[in-house]
């Protein structure tokens, strides 16, 4: 039978670490991490890490009992967790019978938005105390709400990930820019900024709260040339406060009456 892995939480040091081993398996050949989407009972879904690793093809694989994977996450707070993946069989060959290196994976570490993760893995039995243990590590930065996987998460939807304001902005004259956008049912307060290298105009927008999308318009006084300037629309939804997803557009010349209005609905990350 071919070996598989059975993985479970192991928070403290592995028991093998306390024993002396004359020989230990070699290090991993490769370690990779990617996010995967899994459904949860609430109707939302969670993002988990798919951690996959490749074993080095040599006879030291015969000593291999397990591989331990530890993840440290750094965002607003720090998290740390480990799993130990035991091999169900001893390795009888250095490569898979069908060809290629032995490759295994574990799906289970939860992924939060915009978080840097440090993933480390080492084989067990590991090197003796006071010896350099063969290990491998990779970094993984989880995406934010604009990511194609993340944007449908409830937290992201509440931050406006699915809202498309369809911003249009045009220079009416040397002193003013007209900004039009589609409001969101998530909230009724917005701020529109016009900036070149610096902010040349801004306006707070408060629309009557309604549970549907409407088109809002605001005329913003500007202090200098506005054609080609960037418009940034920041929503203030109750669910995300000042950390909601911002949207961008570009100021063009206002068309003459009867000419179709050019659209520009580029998006940016929060804070962009």
């Amino acid at each position: 039978r071919e070996p598989t892995v059975q993985c479970g939480s192991e928070t403290g040091p592995s028991p093998e670490w306390m024993l002396r081993h004359d020989l230990t398996p070699g290090d991993l050949r490769d370690l990779r991490v990617e996010p995967v989407k899994t459904s949860v009972a609430t109707g939302d879904y969670s993002i988990l890490m798919n951690v996959s690793w490749v074993l080095r093809a040599d006879a030291s694989i015969r000593l291999l009992k397990a591989t331990k994977i530890c993840v440290t996450g750094k965002s607003n707070f720090q998290s740390y967790s480990c799993v130990r993946c035991n091999y169900t069989e001893a390795f009888q060959t250095q490569t898979r019978p069908s060809g290629g290196k032995w490759t295994f994976s574990y799906i289970g570490f939860p992924v939060e938005l915009n978080t840097v993760y440090f993933i480390g893995a080492h084989n067990i039995p590991n090197a003796n105390m006071n010896e350099d243990g063969p290990s491998m590590s990779v970094n993984f930065t989880s995406p934010g709400c604009l990511d194609h996987i993340m944007k449908y998460k409830k937290k992201c939807v509440k931050a406006g990930s699915l809202w498309d304001p369809n911003i249009t902005a045009c220079k009416k004259n040397e002193e003013t820019v007209e900004v039009n956008f589609t409001t969101s049912p998530l909230g009724n307060r917005y701020m529109a900024l016009i900036q070149h290298s610096t902010i040349i105009g801004f306006s707070q927008v408060s629309e009557p709260y309604q549970n549907k999308q409407t088109r809002a318009s605001v005329v913003i006084p500007v202090t200098e040339e506005s054609e080609g300037a960037m418009v940034q629309l920041t929503p203030y939804f109750p669910t995300c406060g000042s950390d909601c997803i911002r949207h961008k557009g570009t100021v063009v010349l206002c068309p003459q009456t009867g000419v179709p209005f050019p659209l520009d609905n580029n998006r940016s990350k929060p804070g962009g």
């Epitope: 004359d22 093809a57 040599d58 006879a59 009888q92 490569t95 060809g99 290629g100 290196k101």
Partner: antibody, heavy 118, light 107 residues
Framework: QVQLVQSGAEVKKPGASVKVSCKAS????????MNWVRQAPGQGLEWMGR????????QYNQKFKDRVTMTRDTSISTAYMELSRLRSDDTAVYYC???????????WGQGTLVTVSS | DIQMTQSPSSLSASVGDRVTITCRAS??????LAWYQQKPGKAPKLLLY???NLADGVPSRFSGSGSGTDYTLTISSLQPEDFATYYC?????????FGGGTKVEIK
């Protein structure tokens, strides 16, 4: 049955390169590492390196690292070993040898004599 | 690199003799050892792997033993076709190395 058939004998001048081929049959080529071993006249066996035909991972003996290139063509189940900047002490029989479950050499080619002489 | 030291480098024996060849590794190779037989002008032939396992078609008069760093190949009753050179090889991890060889000659 498993067979490894190597290319014919070569005579080369010092500084030249030689490329030896090893055609495998009778098994799934990508399932086993292919090794190259050489034997100088009247001498012992010397492991030069190995290639995994599945993904072309190569591990060389440091002694040859700068001069040897191992490749493979899975479409014709053939492994190649090229040795460059030949010297007279590279005169040897070069063998391809297929690994077993681990790196014991279960099957060998018939050998290719490479003579380096000015 | 792991060094493999084989002894003796040559020996003379008669048909029916029991022959023993030893191989010492410079470090523990965890029984990852193979033995080969080579006749003049021919490629080596695998005799044993993992110290004790006979390769396909190898007669049972060949046997192996040992662990750690010290290993032995024994031919229980030498036959005329056994006169050849024998090599040990470790496969604990690259680079793989062979012993210097033991030439078994007719007395």
């Amino acid at each position: 049955q498993v067979q490894l058939v190597q290319s014919g004998a070569e005579v080369k001048k010092p500084g030249a390169s030689v490329k030896v081929s090893c055609k495998a049959s009778g098994y799934t080529f990508i399932s086993y590492w292919m090794n190259w071993v050489r034997q100088a006249p009247g001498q012992g066996l010397e492991w030069m390196g190995r290639i995994d035909p599945y993904d072309s991972e190569i591990q060389y003996n440091q002694k040859f690292k700068d001069r040897v290139t191992m490749t493979r063509d899975t479409s014709i189940s053939t492994a190649y070993m090229e040795l460059s900047r030949l010297r007279s002490d590279d005169t040897a029989v070069y063998y391809c040898a297929r690994s077993g479950g681990f790196d014991w050499f279960a099957y060998w080619g018939q050998g290719t004599l490479v003579t380096v002489s000015s | 690199d792991i060094q493999m030291t084989q002894s003796p480098s040559s020996l003379s024996a008669s048909v029916g003799d029991r022959v023993t060849i030893t191989c010492r590794a410079s470090e523990n190779i965890n029984s990852n050892l193979a033995w080969y037989q080579q006749k003049p002008g021919k490629a080596p032939k695998l005799l044993l792997y993992d110290v004790t396992n006979l390769a396909d078609g190898v007669p049972s008069r060949f046997s192996g033993s040992g662990s750690g760093t010290d290993y032995t190949l024994t031919i229980s009753s030498l036959q005329p076709e056994d006169f050849a050179t024998y090599y040990c090889q470790h496969f604990w991890g690259p680079p793989y190395t062979f012993g210097g060889g033991t030439k078994v000659e007719i007395k």
